[in-house]
């Protein structure tokens, strides 16, 4: 005659928390709390986050979803992943650009802007490390070029061009005398 014994629910546990009168089961990620449960250990009334909002974790008390962030066009940011009900927009830099943090102690949530990556080829240098999280790391001069000051200078193609010591070392095969 007695009803089936309900499973024990611990208000201090992960699945149930006291919301209002009762311990209620939380809302899943991507849902917000419309109304708490109306019986001990019951299910709360949960609704899907509206467009352009999200909640990333199971929650018990969020009665509204967080607004999705907009990527900062002024900082040349682009959306790497669009916002969904369960995850915020992931902003980053388009290919050929890298993240330059705006604070010294840089973490994933730090403000940043996008900088165009150095084009090692245009500088006549080898690409030692491709640009992604930081700027491109350029290496030594490409064949046919030698170090001169901060740049790479093309080996002379005729005896008319002067060829200092470093030039001679790299471009010796081109020298006529």
């Amino acid at each position: 005659q007695g009803g089936t014994r309900s499973p024990r629910c611990d208000c201090a546990g992960d699945f149930h928390k006291k919301i209002g009168l009762f311990c209620c089961r939380g809302c899943p990620a991507g849902h917000y709390l419309k109304a708490p449960c109306t019986e001990p250990c019951g299910n709360s009334t949960c609704l899907v986050c509206p467009q352009d909002t999200f909640l990333a974790w199971e929650n018990h008390h969020n009665s509204e979803c967080a607004r999705c962030q907009a990527c900062d066009e002024q900082a040349s940011q682009v959306a790497l992943e669009n916002c969904s009900a369960v995850a915020d927009t992931r902003c980053g830099c388009k290919p050929g650009w890298f993240v330059e943090c705006q604070v010294s102690q840089c973490v994933s949530s730090s403000p940043f802007y996008c900088q165009p990556c150095l084009d090692c080829g245009a500088l006549h240098r080898h690409t030692r490390l491709l640009c992604s999280r930081r700027d491109t790391d350029c290496g030594t001069c490409l064949p046919g070029f030698y170090e001169h000051g901060d740049g790479c200078v093309s080996c002379p193609t005729s005896t008319l061009g002067s060829c200092p010591e470093r030039c001679a070392a790299v471009c010796g095969w081109r020298q006529m005398f």
């Epitope: 009803g3 006291k18 919301i19 009168l21 009762f22 109306t38 019986e39 001990p40 008390h61």
Partner: antibody
């Protein structure tokens, strides 16, 4: 000792509004859920609303949802029932109750009741 | 909603005799081994009084001639030896789930 003193009842026309108050004393008001129960003339008891302690969530039956609001002012040890869009069928004596929680089962019983205040909805 | 049905609607018992009032719920009001139901007494011009909670626990200050029993869906309030001051209307009520619901009441009189 424990007391729940009610006020705010009276005669109101259909579609009108009324605000009931319940002043509590003799216990730590903020630690208890509180309810309103009503009793139509010559009829039984009907639950009208409950407000939780702490986070002040409110609950209503369908018969009054979207017309009634319950609120509490813990600083003033007071409970309120704002009744809008009143209908003839809302005519009743309204009781304020203290809801005591028993054990870890999240189980409530109305352990103290006010004397009631009469609300008459009539044109 | 959980419907609570009391029987009888009215009852006349001689002083010193046993009075029994029944209450049936339309579904179980049991939770975690406890029956979430109570009994109240209503006398004219007095606040209602909680007599029994969790089906069988007598509220402090209530005379021990009052007792409650039952589980699941069927419950009983018993007054072992009726006294003149017990003339009142008695209500059962469930707290298993919202909306909280009451029985229609049983009027107890002296025969």
């Amino acid at each position: 000792q424990m007391q729940l003193v009610q006020s705010g009842g009276g005669l109101v026309k259909p579609g009108g509004s009324l605000r009931l108050s319940c002043a509590a004393s003799g216990f730590t008001f903020s630690s208890y859920a509180m309810s309103w129960i009503r009793q139509a003339p010559g009829k039984g008891l009907e639950w009208v609303s409950t407000i939780s302690d702490g986070d002040s969530y409110s609950y209503f039956p369908d018969s009054v949802k979207d017309r009634f609001t319950i609120s509490r002012d813990n600083a003033k040890n007071s409970l309120y029932l704002q009744m809008n869009s009143l209908r003839a069928e809302d005519t009743a004596v309204y009781y304020c109750t203290r809801d005591r929680i028993y054990g870890s089962v999240q189980y409530y019983a109305m352990d103290y009741w006010g004397r009631g205040t009469l609300v008459t909805v009539s044109s | 909603d959980v419907v609570m049905t009391q029987s009888p609607d009215s009852l006349a018992v001689s002083l010193g005799e046993r009075a029994t009032i029944s209450c049936r719920a339309s579904e179980s009001v049991e939770f975690s081994g406890t029956s979430l139901m109570q009994w109240y007494q209503q006398k004219p011009r007095q606040p209602l009084k909680l007599l029994i909670y969790a089906a069988s626990n007598v509220e402090s200050g209530v005379p021990d001639r009052f007792s409650g029993s039952g589980s699941g869906t069927d419950f009983t309030l018993t007054i072992s030896s009726l006294q003149a001051e017990d003339v009142a209307v008695y209500y059962c009520q469930q707290s298993r789930k919202l909306p909280y619901t009451f029985g229609q009441g049983t009027r107890l009189e002296i025969k």
